[in-house]
């Protein structure tokens, strides 16, 4: 038997992936556990193996189909269960009726690149990955720039209230190393949250021209 509090949180990436994290206080160390997805109106069901991410939490990704296929809609309800092996049988450790479009978290933006860099400014572009066509262009972004001597947590957030997959960073210091990250969020869903931050993009501003005012 397992005592202690349990938390089971899942998000839908809006296309063909449900990512889940299960935490359990009185942790089961060497037990095999999985997440099972059973939709109320689809012919498929799916399972993924929970793998440890920390002392008392496990994670896995339910792959529902090809990355850009639209596998669920607003009317789907998916019963998600955490099942752990106890001897020869499986025990239900957690269960939820999951409404995918109320629990959205998109994939992190990808393909970040420097389009143009100068002494004081830098133009950066990115792409979104596996976002549903239902959203069309109605997404918002947050971006942040890491300056020398600061932490990511100290970086001010820049908000883009539309599907703008580029940004022009200004008032930068010449010949300075920076890093840049961006994340995305749809408008839909009561429990929807920001995507993970993108992989950081490192860039360096151009040095100021010698003998010129900067």
């Amino acid at each position: 038997a397992v005592n202690g509090t349990s938390q089971f949180t899942c998000f839908y990436n809006s296309r063909a992936n449900i990512s889940c994290v299960w935490s359990q206080d009185g942790a089961l160390q060497d037990t095999s556990c999985q997440v099972h997805a059973w939709p109320d109106r689809r012919r498929w069901n799916q399972t993924c193996e929970l793998l440890p991410v920390s002392q008392a939490s496990w994670a896995c990704n339910l792959i529902l189909g090809a990355p850009d296929s639209q596998k669920l809609t607003t009317v789907d309800i998916v019963t998600l269960r955490v099942l752990c092996r106890e001897g020869v049988r499986w025990r239900v450790m957690a269960i939820q009726d999951f409404k995918p479009f109320e629990n959205l978290r998109l994939m992190a933006p990808i393909s970040l690149q420097v389009v143009h860099v100068e002494t004081h400014r830098c133009n950066i572009s990115w792409e979104i990955s596996q976002a549903s066509h239902y959203f069309e262009r109605h997404l918002e972004f947050e971006a942040r720039t890491l300056s020398p001597g600061h932490t990511w947590e100290e970086a001010p957030l820049l908000t883009l209230k539309q599907k703008q997959e580029w940004i022009c960073l200004e008032t930068l210091t010449p010949d300075t190393q920076y890093e840049f990250q961006v994340r995305v969020k749809p408008l839909q869903g009561e429990f929807t949250t920001w995507s993970p931050w993108s992989q950081p993009l490192a860039f360096r501003t151009k040095p100021a021209a010698l003998g010129k005012d900067t």
């Epitope: 109106r41 639209q70 809609t73 607003t74 009317v75 789907d76 066509h133 262009r137 109605h138 839909q188």
Partner: nanobody, 119 residues
Framework: QVQLVESGGGSVQTGGSLRLSCVVS????????MGWYRQVPGKQRELVAD???????KYADSVKGRFTILRDSVKNTVTLQMSSLNPEDTGVYYC?????????????WGQGTQVTVTS
Amino acid sequence: QVQLVESGGGSVQTGGSLRLSCVVSGSHFISDVMGWYRQVPGKQRELVADMADGGSAKYADSVKGRFTILRDSVKNTVTLQMSSLNPEDTGVYYCKAGLWITGRHSDYWGQGTQVTVTS
């Protein structure tokens, strides 16, 4: 402005058939589900059948094998072919569409069409 227009209701005898149609029109939208609900006096509106993207149809137990739902997501139409009708199928039938407009999802309803089955 989004509009749902239903047609095809009427009176029919027990064992007969009817075909209900609904078309969604209006400003820019994407539909992810369309279906039919019915309401009888003194009761809540209940699902008859609907069809979501991916072709998954859902039917009320009482109509399985008798009713067939067809959805054209390009023309934004949904039809309900009803056969072997009985008096319990009497009621006002409402078309419902789940529509994505400017990044948010909402449900839209038609005005309803009366179906009467007499014995």
